[in-house]
């Protein structure tokens, strides 16, 4: 099933201690899906979308950026025929960096 879209959303982190907010959204015909956020291939967080919504926002506490390394991806799962779980393709990667403040 098609990959979700992924995006870092504001407020954006300015240091590694700041929280990170990452939204993940399934295509239009998959509301209420279960979403998994990965970083460097490891599971970071799981969330379920409301039954009338296509997406979720993962809120990662400060320091989540430190390990493991690599970009974030997300994936969703839905119940298919015969109540079998179907997993989507992985989203595109999204990178998080911490800009040098411009004084």
């Amino acid at each position: 099933i098609p990959a979700p879209s992924i995006r870092l959303v504001p407020p954006y982190p300015s240091s590694q201690e700041d929280p990170i907010h990452i939204a993940c959204m399934a295509p239009g015909n998959f509301p209420g899906a279960n979403f998994t956020l990965y970083r460097g291939g490891q599971v970071v967080q799981l969330l379920q979308a409301p039954t009338d919504q296509r997406g979720v926002t993962f809120n990662l506490s400060g320091g989540s950026s430190k390990a493991p390394g690599g970009p974030f991806h997300c994936q969703y799962g839905v119940l298919g025929e015969l109540n079998q779980s179907q997993l989507s393709d992985l989203s595109e990667p999204v990178n998080v960096s911490f800009p040098v403040p411009t004084w």
């Epitope: 879209s5 504001p10 407020p11 954006y12 919504q53 998080v96």
Partner: antibody, heavy 120, light 111 residues
């Protein structure tokens, strides 16, 4: 106060290139995602591209994908749109706009726009 | 990337209310709450009026309100004033990285 000032528009022949700039002031530019939105004469708004606060993630409308490149220089508080292989249908006023500070709070600040005319 | 559907025009008398609709699909307007409304005067840049369906930025009069039902979002302008005469655009995300606009609605305030 927040200011976004576009420049670089003008008359250009089909197939040629143009680079637009958007100079930002009055806010911490490096903390905001930035968009380009265009409006053909007498027509509605059309989203063109977005770039993340740090420049690492960029997305484009299908109509400009492969021809336009959005970029930013946070040290200069400036957003850019490199437009290649221009077509007559790219004729429009091009606006830069900043995302809100909160989640999905819309495009809360806009520049005054710069007119790009593609014609032979 | 087809535009969201808005009526081309709307009108109302001063003091009355008018509602402008914005119809999409379950893939955009109906699938989340990331709907915004913008006001644009001729020759000027758009101005944000409503975000996340019904939230007003500071400085926007409470005469402007937003709502959503199913795949249709609505902007209501109550207590119409002459200075409300402008073009109004809705926007929504088709996916997280693809912003769509409606075709725009020209609002006319009658005598």
């Amino acid at each position: 106060q927040v200011q976004l000032v576009e420049s670089g528009g003008g008359l250009v022949q089909p197939g040629r290139s143009l680079r637009l700039s958007c100079a930002a002031s009055g806010f911490t530019f490096s903390s905001y995602g930035m968009h380009w939105v265009r409006q053909a004469p007498g027509k509605g708004l059309e989203w063109v591209a977005v770039i993340s606060y740090d420049g690492s993630n960029k997305y484009y409308a299908d109509s400009v994908k492969g021809r336009f490149t959005i970029s930013r220089d946070n040290s200069k508080n400036t957003l850019y749109l490199q437009m290649n292989s221009l077509r007559a249908e790219d004729t429009a006023v091009y606006y830069c706009a900043s995302e809100g500070v909160d989640f999905w709070s819309g495009l809360d600040y806009w520049g005054q726009g710069t007119l790009v005319t593609v014609s032979s | 990337q087809s535009a969201l559907t808005q009526p081309r025009s709307a009108s109302g008398s001063a003091g009355q209310s008018v509602t402008i609709s914005c119809t999409g699909t379950s893939s955009d307007v109906g699938g989340h709450n990331y709907v915004s409304w913008y006001q644009q005067f001729p020759g000027k840049a758009p101005k944000l009026l409503i975000y996340e369906v019904s939230h007003r930025p500071s400085g926007v009069p409470d005469r402007f309100s937003g709502s959503k039902s199913g795949n249709t979002a609505s902007l209501t302008v109550s207590g119409l004033q002459a200075e409300d005469e402008a073009d109004y655009y809705c926007s929504s995300y088709a996916d997280l990285n693809n912003l769509m606009f409606g075709g725009g609605t020209k609002l006319t305030v009658l005598g």
